[in-house]
Amino acid sequence: ESGYAQNGDLEDAELDDYSFSCYSQLEVNGSQHSLTCAFEDPDVNTTNLEFEICGALVEVKCLNFRKLQEIYFIETKKFLLIGKSNICVKVGEKSLTCKKIDLTTIVKPEAPFDLSVIYREGANDFVVTFNTSHLQKKYVKVLMHDVAYRQEKDENKWTHVNLSSTKLTLLQRKLQPAAMYEIKVRSIPDHYFKGFWSEWSPSYYFRTPEINNSSGEMD
């Protein structure tokens, strides 16, 4: 069966809203970069629809995306990362909608990992540390991190702390005693690149000590 739409299909296609959004991930697999696009409307009939990127590529004029369920995806070394590319939704040879995008302005970092919290009894504080793959990267090295924590019983009462390092100290007196806390972290490009928040890291759970009644301090 041909991948080209019949005339009736084409007319129907032109009535639909083909708004889409994309994000890039640089050096996501060694020196390979990725670009992921998806339609804003999850109900768009994606049969026969393809994505193509042209311009600001190395050695080739255009590249086609692979379709993975409802997302469209490229992994390649061929992004120039200088100037604007044209990303189009196509049916056959016809472009339905296009966007000009500089791939360095839609960067979504990889999620931080290895989040942990260590209680320091003598200092009466908690040291939060985590790791990011971006420390080893050539391009997106400078990130802003958002550490969010909450008492487990407070469903939507998150406290956020922004930091540029991968270490944070939480003072014991700022937390409730004998409580279970959930903590997580995400990252966004800070210098030289623009884009979106990463996915959240897996959550880490920790319990604060009881209060020692005689001294008024936590155990």
Epitope: G55, I82, T105, Y192, F193
Partner: nanobody, 118 residues
Framework: EVQLVESGGGLVQAGGSLRLSCESS????????MGWFRQAPGKEREFLSA????????HYSDSVQGRFTISRDNAKNTVYLQMNSLKSEDTGRYYC???????????WGQGTQVTVSS
């Protein structure tokens, strides 16, 4: 109306250095890619180097890699080309270009002449 103005060209001996500047009056400078090209007498214009909007990403042609360095100052709307170890074959008119959009440079300067004598 003048939008890109190159300066810094001149006569230099082989092995010497020059620093070219290109000042832009285009309002989108800080989000635009910039590039340097040259045209030797009787030859086509050739790409030398390009730099992304933030300065984080740069590219060089094989002919200038390791000798030329591109940089930019977004506060001054200026892009630079530091040229070291110049050779006689580097002689030509040097142009800067702005806004690399789907493989086409949208704006061009008038160029500045560089002559390398041996």
């Amino acid at each position: 109306e003048v939008q890109l103005v190159e300066s810094g060209g001149g006569l230099v001996q082989a092995g010497g250095s020059l620093r070219l500047s290109c000042e832009s009056s285009i309002s989108t400078f800080s989000s635009d890619a910039m590039g340097w090209f040259r045209q030797a007498p009787g030859k086509e214009r050739e790409f030398l180097s390009a730099i992304g909007w933030s300065g984080a990403v740069t590219h060089y042609s094989d002919s200038v890699q390791g000798r030329f360095t591109i940089s930019r100052d977004n506060a001054k709307n200026t892009v630079y080309l530091q040229m070291n170890s110049l050779k006689s074959e580097d002689t030509g008119r040097y142009y800067c270009a702005e806004d690399y959009d789907t493989d086409v440079w949208q704006y061009w300067g008038q160029g500045t002449q560089v002559t390398v004598s041996s």
